[in-house]
Interface confidence: low
């Protein structure tokens, strides 16, 4: 029998350029009579144009929703009701071709054409894009608060904030023809739930979304977004009601930046430069294409690309890369944003060099990508260390910490976290190396103690990049480095003259002069430690709540012992900057470290002194007794302590702790405590120092109170941020 044909709605969005009309400011105000009159005419013209083609039989509805410069650009959408089987045949490209063909056929015609009665439409200026009913609904919901802005070359335009009565607004932005728009978003409040979405076209087309940001992001307080061309739309959706705008938006046109380079690398190892997407750290734009050609001086070397919070992964060929596509020597890889460092190592087999291509495959983009490039020795990629094939990084081998996700850096170790004697491969503890006392059969532990040695897991790297064999040589009163750098920056780690810790004892004034109390409105929240004249280190999770993220809330007390009283040695500071580790992950507690810059430098005294920071190679031996201090609860669930408590804890082997916590302990964590519990940190101790005393009598910061199951529970150790695992970031910030 007869079967009715199934019809479907196909939605298109687009723009066209009118050559015989000029844009005026009146046309930006939807309530103006000029806008109403122009839309009526433009709508009529659009309908007539569509119905003049074979698309006419499918015409359903259309709307011109705004105007822009150029001389006059009309922005519109229309809906065609088409048979389902023809859906794929009427792609935006086909529809655009049909309409352009119609326009061209009447350019020189003297016959009366309805759609040319008032408008001279430029066939080359017609753009048709795919849209959806949902896109039109989103557009319509913003039209009550619609802003059009044209921004000229050399201008930076600050956009007027959203209408507080509206729940959604749209900024339609346009710039000069051959430029691209760069939008800058700066969050100004610590807490909000507003959502901003940026589009690479004039309206909110989901398929042309560049990015969307939500809720006063602390990790991205400033976001810069590039469009692929001179048009962009920004849609705001209201979050919590706030009289103050939680953000500032500004836009400027910028010239296209070429992203092609030919480089010849020098005959040396390590990083030699940086490649980045245009306008880094701006988000890369849709349609970005970069091509970098690097020539390597010899086949002894491979090319290393070191990424920050970005990794490359293999992807099935038919799936698009959502975070950037890379082709390296004809291998297709997809970018992936991660909270870890990553390196891609490219073996070199021919002197022709290596071409690296980066492409944004879809309109959705992300933070600009920057990569450090350099050479590595193909026969020995990680001298003295282990090459982790999972992430391309060189990691310490056989130090008792599984730095590589697959744990292979701790496999097949003859001596784990100990020194291997040359004579018979016996293992001796590290503090016995270069201590003046031969412990190996023929004294190999005391050889080469006065000279440079190849760098390795436990060697100390001097400022001149040479390495010394003696473990933990920092600040022990004896220069071991040729340049004496192991004895520099040693005004630290000494206790003053002095006669929430569970199972602890009360500290005396000056006993822990680096201890900080971080307070909000007079209430102790977290501990911390002074590490430099203007820097206090603490745990990132202290600022986890959005309400705790603003620097103005915090006061830092140093030289304090009692919470309920002040004494002359005590000093307080406001916080000028708060920096969380960029890889900090709330759920896993990984990289749980933050740095606070004080509003003025400390004046050192018996009660206020910094603790010593360890080198990356500093070895804190499991079994060592160290100390934690803080005003945390004296029992699980209890109130904080009035007096600064101290307790000794034992450093626990990583594999034992990892097992206790079911393998949730990362290489940036260190465990301390006792199998039977009792002595431990507790609520309120977070961010406080775990310090270990070196043979020199100086105290080194080993960890920061981070997490654990309960307080002082049997079988569950305290977990601390491992300072040696985050020391490079600390030094980068502080220096």
């Amino acid at each position: 029998g007869y079967k009715a044909e199934v019809m479907v709605s196909q939605v298109y969005s687009g723009s066209l350029r009118v050559l015989n009309r000029h844009f005026s400011q009146d046309l930006t105000r939807r309530e103006s009579s000029a806008f109403r009159s122009e839309t009526a005419k433009a709508q009529k013209m659009l309908k007539e144009l569509i119905t003049s083609t074979r698309l006419g039989t499918y015409y359903n509805s259309s709307s011109v929703y705004s105007f822009g410069e150029g001389p006059l650009t009309c922005f519109f959408w229309f809906i065609l009701q088409i048979p389902e089987h023809r859906r794929l045949m009427l792609s935006p490209e086909v529809v655009q071709a049909l309409l352009v063909e119609e326009l061209l056929s009447t350019v020189n015609s003297s016959a009366a054409v309805p759609y040319r009665a008032e408008y001279e439409v430029d066939p080359e200026g017609l753009v048709i894009l795919e849209a959806s009913v949902k896109d039109i609904a989103a557009l319509n919901s913003t039209l009550g608060c619609y802003r059009y802005s044209y921004v000229g070359q050399g201008q930076v335009l600050r956009l007027k904030g959203p209408d507080h009565l509206a729940s959604s607004c749209l900024w339609h932005l346009q710039g000069p023809k051959d430029l691209m728009l760069k939008l800058r978003l700066e969050w100004t409040l610590a807490e909000c739930r507003d959502r901003l979405a940026m589009y690479d076209v004039a309206g909110p087309l989901e398929k042309r979304l560049i990015t969307s940001v939500y809720g006063c992001s602390r990790q991205e307080p400033v976001v810069e977004v590039l469009a692929s061309g001179a048009i962009m739309a920004v849609v705001w959706k209201k979050g919590l009601h706030s009289y103050y705008d939680p953000f500032v938006l500004s836009v400027q046109p910028v010239v296209f930046q070429a992203c092609e380079v030919n480089l010849t690398l020098d005959n040396r190892l390590d990083s030699q430069g940086v490649l980045s997407t245009p306008y880094f750290p701006s988000y890369y734009s849709p349609q970005t294409h970069c091509s970098w050609h690097l020539t390597v001086p010899s086949l002894d070397y491979g090319l290393a690309l070191w990424f920050d919070a970005y990794a490359l992964r293999r992807q099935k060929y038919d799936l698009p890369c959502t975070q950037g596509q890379w082709t390296i020597q004809n291998r297709r890889l997809c970018g992936l944003r991660i909270l870890q460092p990553y390196a891609e190592r490219i073996p070199v087999v021919a002197t022709a060099g290596i071409t690296i291509n980066f492409t944004s495959q879809i309109s959705l983009t992300g933070p600009g990508v920057r990569v450090h490039y350099g050479l590595y020795n193909q026969s020995d990629p990680c001298p003295g260390e282990f090459l982790c094939s999972v992430n391309g990084l060189c990691v310490p081998a056989c130090d008792g910490v599984k730095d590589c996700p697959n744990g292979l850096d701790e496999r097949n170790c003859v001596c784990r976290a100990t020194f291997q004697c040359k004579e018979d491969s016996t293992c001796i503890s590290l503090p016995k190396v270069c201590d003046g006392q031969p412990d190996c059969l023929n004294g190999s532990d005391e050889e080469q103690c006065q000279e440079g040695v190849p760098c390795g897991t436990f060697t100390f790297q001097c400022e001149d990049r040479s390495c010394v064999k003696k473990p933990n040589p920092q600040c022990d009163g004896r220069p071991d480095c040729r340049d004496g750098s192991d004895e520099e920056h040693c005004d630290c780690g000494l206790q003053g003259p002095s006669s929430r810790i569970v199972g602890g004892a009360v500290s005396s004034e000056g006993e822990w002069p680096w201890q900080a109390s971080l307070q909000v409105r007079g209430r102790h929240i977290c501990g911390g430690a002074l590490i430099a004249d203007r820097w206090v280190i603490t745990a990132a999770h202290c600022f986890q709540e959005d309400s705790m993220a603003s620097t103005v809330l915090w006061t830092v007390f140093l030289g304090k012992v009692w919470q309920n009283s002040r004494w002359p040695g005590e000093v307080s500071f406001k916080v000028s900057r708060l920096l969380l580790h960029p890889y900090h992950e709330e759920d896993s507690h990984d990289y749980d470290v933050a740095l606070l810059q004080l509003d003025h430098p400390v004046v050192r005294s018996a009660a206020v002194r910094p603790v010593c920071l360890p080198a990356r190679s500093h070895f804190f031996e499991p079994g060592l007794h160290c100390w934690i201090t803080g005003w945390g609860a004296l029992r699980e669930g209890g109130p904080i302590s009035n007096a600064l408590q101290k307790v000794d804890v034992q450093l626990i082997p990583q594999d034992l702790c990892s097992e206790v916590y079911r393998y949730q302990v990362t290489p940036r964590m260190l465990c301390a405590g006792y199998r039977k519990g009792k002595k431990d940190a507790c609520q309120g101790d977070s961010g406080g120092p775990l310090v270990c005393k070196a043979l020199s009598g100086r105290w080194f910061l080993a960890g920061l109170v981070s997490w654990g199951l309960g307080c002082g529970r049997p079988n569950y150790f305290g977990v601390y941020t491992r300072i040696t695992g985050v020391i490079s970031w600390i030094q980068q910030v502080v220096t």
Epitope: Q650, P653, D655, L656, E659, V660, R662, Y663, Y674, R675, K676, P714, N715
Partner: antibody
Framework: QLQLQESGPGLVKPSETLSLTCTVS??????????WGWIRQSPGKGLEWIGS???????YYNPSLKSRVTISVDTSKNQLSLKVNSVTAADTAVYYC?????????????WGQGTLVTVSS | SYELTQPPSVSVSPGQTATLTCSGD??????VCWFQQKPGQSPLLVMY???KRPSGIPERFSGSNSGNTATLTISGTQALDEADYYC?????????FGGGTKLTVL
């Protein structure tokens, strides 16, 4: 309730490889709370720990046996295996498998009934 | 390597208290468990985490551990308690058993 049953050849020739299987019933070997261990007891002697394994593949071995021992699990069969290479008469013993508390408080409970392996030509 | 030392034998009259000891360097920092083994049988756990009794183990069994010595005490010893007793602890990455004590009920 949980039961463990060791099986394998009762006689192995010197220098050959001893292979035993422990089949677990009444509980999953892939439980995240437990390790699974092998212990042996030479005739008239005390208990000697051979090694322990977590279902994800993490293993710990007795240092004195480490070079000759391999422990593995097959979670699909709910089985634990032991291989000891290059055996000598000193490897003659009753071999037990046991479930071990996973958090290094270290107790073994329950135990299999044990299987006697004699190394002799 | 870490060692646990137990006396080879202990004798006790029925109804008396038997005290079995296990010593090792800083053993009190570690947890200790105890196994009972009767001839021809598999070991049976009688005490774990120093002082905890598995279900089914009589109340006359008790344990303690401090300093360098762990103790298993059997009060009101019965003839059926006659067996070999092994202590066990962890050291770093290894499980360590004591050499065992033969308890004889006279």
């Amino acid at each position: 309730q949980l039961q463990l049953q060791e099986s394998g050849p009762g006689l192995v020739k010197p220098s050959e490889t001893l292979s035993l299987t422990c089949t677990v019933s009444g509980g999953a070997i892939s439980s995240s709370n437990y390790f699974w261990g092998w212990i042996r007891q030479s005739p008239g002697k005390g208990l000697e720990w051979i090694g322990s394994m977590y279902y994800t593949g993490i293993t710990y071995y007795n240092p004195s046996l480490k070079s000759r021992v391999t422990i593995s699990v097959d979670t699909s069969k709910n089985q634990l295996s032991l291989k000891v290479n290059s055996v000598t008469a000193a490897d003659t013993a009753v071999y037990y498998c046991a479930r071990q508390d996973g958090f290094r408080t270290g107790w073994f409970d329950p135990w299999g009934q044990g299987t006697l392996v004699t190394v002799s030509s | 390597s870490y060692e646990l030392t137990q006396p080879p034998s202990v004798s006790v009259s029925p109804g008396q208290t038997a005290t079995l000891t296990c010593s090792g360097d800083k053993l009190g920092d570690n947890y200790v468990c105890w196994f009972q083994q009767k001839p021809g049988q598999s070991p049976l756990l009688v005490m774990y985490q120093d002082t905890k009794r598995p279900s089914g183990i009589p109340e006359r069994f008790s344990g303690s551990n401090s300093g360098n010595t762990a103790t298993l005490t059997i009060s009101g010893t019965q003839a059926l308690d006659e067996a070999d007793y092994y202590c066990q602890a962890w050291d770093s990455r290894t499980v360590v058993f004591g050499g065992g004590t033969k308890l004889t009920v006279l």
